[in-house]
């Protein structure tokens, strides 16, 4: 057995093709009948299929055939259009011929689908050549549902693909109307249109009137390289047909609407864009629209027409910019359900949607963001950010104009500078301390809502974690303990794992803030403390000398400290400790550790003139749990 | 200029060991807490130890507890991670970090390779 023939067989995408004695063609030495010259199919085709010109062209793969039906064309492989525009595509038939007694013989048949080649049943080169039925006088748009070359593209590998383009060259323009290109005409000084405009929708035909003789325009398309370079690659001459249709007495055809979009207390015209429709028997003025259900956005008026709402207008009122819509209502979508009719066909549904914009808008800011301390961390809330116009707009949309200085704002765990409100009300969007040298930070925003901005500026406050206790009044002139009933950072110590440290500010305004000696023995007196740490409130080293209110009547009154504790891995924190101070009263039981009482209530009891602790706190009417501190 | 500089980085085998050291200029590390933080290729940051220079309390990660120790000299304003029994996971960009009243400053880091 001897196999002659080409063995490839070149074919029209999507078509059928027989094989031929010149692709395919067994004989034997013995002269076989081409009945018995017998293939069997031991890998079908990938990209269509083979099957016999006399049976059921839809049923199973054909697996055996002759010789005898190659010669008479009965063989036939039938490719398939995939989804995805290819130029040139190959595909290979894997067969076994056999003629008992002699050997089997194995042959491979190559398939070429390609555009390339002249097909008769398929006239153009191009993925889509279609052409485009027109209504009389009216416009169409030529989409690529009807031309597109990006076949051509496919010819390109894909990762240049993006740097090309198709070009079309019109070589003979329409004679009954006229090619637009972004709304501007093609001419002969500018006789070109790209694949990406006819993709993009930009490519318009507008038929000029005057009978409904066919149209069309002949073309040059070939590859685009980058900036416009022109390159090597597939390339075709074609035309393109445009069939003109009669439209008298049909039925007008209502086009698609675009909503109309204004602003709350503003007044705009209703144009084509909201309310068209295709009727070349009609005249304008004759095509009636009623109002059968208004919304409560605002209403139609009419320009001269008086101030009052309207319910019946022309598509001529609309055409000549007289209808208009007044938003005197809230600023929501609203639709106007219309009736409309030429007068001879039977009235048509169609709406009108109305989006009412707001006119301003107001970021909402009612409280800074408190991050606790241990955590350095905080999810934003509505607390923080909340967009309001005449109503909350829950879909507002927030950037990041300037940022924090001492830290990021992070969704999902990433750093961002865009977000929805939806994200803030899930509680998605969180400000993380990553700088720990300020207890507060703030970041700007502008909110984006319904086409309006408006910016803010979100505060961020670190809060203590520090008990603070100050119990009862304090007695002035005395020197009481400050250890941890008071001031307590143990919490933040053990989540730390570090010691944490104090500094004063600010106050106290009638007093001080000192450092006591450790033992009677120790030498010299009291040390004013600027700053101090956790381990030296629980060795009980410190102690606040309260002063009295100076200039007046002796009495209680009030003051505070005002204290920045930070510890290791956490921002730091401002907090306060207010308390009351009353003149020292000796038969009371102060909440406190005295260090020392008022030397005068000291030479009155007869008390020797030192400064011994008066011991631990007297007894208490009761005992509240320490609160927590307010960061500052 | 406020600085911090990590020096003693390398290559060394796997079991071997390296000194790595943090020095201060321009503000007193006495009154501040120290961290090292390193970054390995295509992963996360991971503060491998941190010490309180007052009170000399230490932290270290899971990773490195017994291997390595942190430690402050604050007469030559430094502080230091010895690293002992280093491992290949332990490879990484290592970084230290100052953290006290109102500063909080990062040196360049200093590179770790440990491999065969």
């Known amino acids: 057995l001897s196999l002659k023939g080409s063995q490839t067989l070149t074919v029209c995408p999507g078509s059928v093709q027989p094989l031929s004695s010149q692709t395919l063609r067994a004989s034997s030495s013995a002269g076989t009948d081409p009945q018995l010259l017998l293939y069997r199919v031991v890998r079908g085709p990938q990209l269509g299929r083979l099957f016999h010109a006399q049976q059921d062209s839809t049923g199973e793969a054909l697996v055996n055939f002759t010789q005898a039906e190659v010669y008479a064309g009965n063989i036939l492989y039938e490719h398939e259009m995939p989804p995805e525009p290819f130029w040139e595509a190959h595909d290979t038939l894997e067969l076994q011929l056999s003629s008992p007694p002699a050997r089997d013989v194995a042959a491979t048949l190559a398939v070429a689908v390609s555009f390339e080649a002249a097909c008769p049943q398929r006239p153009s080169h191009l993925w889509k050549n279609k052409g485009l039925w027109v209504p009389e006088g009216q416009r169409a748009r030529i989409t690529v549902a009807a031309l597109d070359a990006s076949n051509l593209l496919a010819s390109v590998p894909s990762p240049q693909r993006s740097e090309h383009d198709v070009l079309f060259q019109v070589t003979q323009f329409p004679s009954r109307g006229q090619l637009l290109v972004s709304e501007e005409p093609l001419h002969a000084g500018q006789p070109h249109f790209l694949q990406s405009q006819l993709a993009a929708g930009q490519l318009v035909y507008a038929h000029g009137g005057g009978g409904t003789q066919q149209d069309g325009f002949h073309f040059r398309a070939h590859l685009q390289g980058p900036a416009g370079a022109s390159v090597a690659g597939p390339q075709t001459s074609e035309a393109f047909a445009i069939t003109v249709r009669d439209v008298n007495e049909r039925p007008p055809q209502p086009q698609a609407s675009v909503p109309l979009r204004l602003t709350r207390g503003s007044r705009a015209p209703i144009s084509r864009a909201q309310l068209s429709v295709v009727d070349p028997d009609s005249a304008p003025g004759e095509i009636e629209y009623e109002v059968q259900r208004a919304p409560h956005n605002g209403f139609l008026s009419l320009v001269g027409g008086g101030l009052g709402p309207v319910t019946r207008f022309t598509q001529a009122d609309v055409d000549s910019g007289r209808l208009a819509f007044v938003a005197n209502g809230s600023s929501v979508a609203g639709i106007f359900q219309l009736s409309m009719s030429d007068g001879a066909s039977p009235p048509l549904p169609m709406s009108l949607a109305v989006d009412i914009l707001p006119s301003a808008i107001e970021v909402q800011l009612r409280a800074p963001l408190e991050v606790p301390q241990a955590l350095g961390r905080s999810s934003l809330s509505q607390q923080q950010l909340r967009v309001v116009s005449d109503r909350e707009e829950p879909e507002a949309a927030y950037r990041l104009i300037q940022g924090p200085q001492y830290g990021h704002l992070l969704v999902g765990g990433r750093p961002t500078s865009a977000f929805s409100q939806f994200q803030i009300d899930q509680g998605e969007v969180v400000f993380a301390f990553t700088n720990f040298s300020s207890s507060h930070d703030h970041f700007r925003v502008l909110a984006l809502a319904r086409g309006v901005n408006a910016s803010a500026v979100v505060n961020v406050t670190v809060r203590a974690l520090l008990h603070v206790w100050a119990g009862g009044p304090w007695p002035q002139g005395a020197t009481l303990r400050l250890d941890p009933t008071v001031l307590d950072a143990g919490e933040l110590a053990n989540r730390t794992g570090s010691v944490p440290r104090f500094r004063l500010l600010e106050g106290p305004r009638h007093g001080r803030v000192v450092r006591v000696p450790r033992a009677r023995t120790e030498p010299g007196g009291s040390q004013l403390v600027e700053q101090f740490t956790q381990q030296d409130l629980e060795d009980g080293r410190l102690g606040l000398e309260v002063g009295r209110p100076e200039g007046r009547a002796p009495g209680p009154a009030g003051d505070s400290l005002t204290l920045e504790l930070w510890a290791q891995g956490v921002p730091p924190a401002v907090a306060s400790l207010d308390f009351a101070t009353e003149p020292y009263n000796a038969a009371r039981p102060y909440s406190v550790a005295l260090l020392s009482v008022p030397e005068a209530a000291r030479t009155e009891a007869g008390k020797p003139e030192s400064s011994t602790p008066t011991g631990e706190p007297g007894p208490m009417a009761s005992s509240p749990e320490p609160a927590v501190a307010k960061g500052g | 200029e406020v600085q911090l500089v990590e020096s003693g980085g390398g290559l060394v085998q796997p079991g071997g060991s390296l000194r790595l050291s943090c020095a201060a200029s321009?503000?007193?590390?006495?009154?501040?807490?120290i961290g090292w933080v390193r970054r390995a290729p295509g992963k996360g940051t991971e503060l491998v130890a941190s010490?309180?220079?007052?009170?000399?309390?230490?932290r270290y990660a899971d990773s490195v507890k017994g291997r390595f120790t942190i430690s402050c000299d604050t007469s030559k304003n430094t502080a230091y991670l010895q690293m002992n029994s280093l491992r290949a996971e332990d490879t990484a960009v290592y970084y230290c970090?100052?953290?006290?009243?109102?500063?909080?400053?990062w040196g360049q880091g200093t590179t770790v390779t440990v491999s065969s």
């Open positions: 321009s503000f007193n590390i006495k009154d501040t807490y």
């Open positions: 970090a100052a953290q006290g009243y109102r500063l909080h400053y």
């Open positions: 010490i309180d220079c007052i009170y000399g309390y230490t």
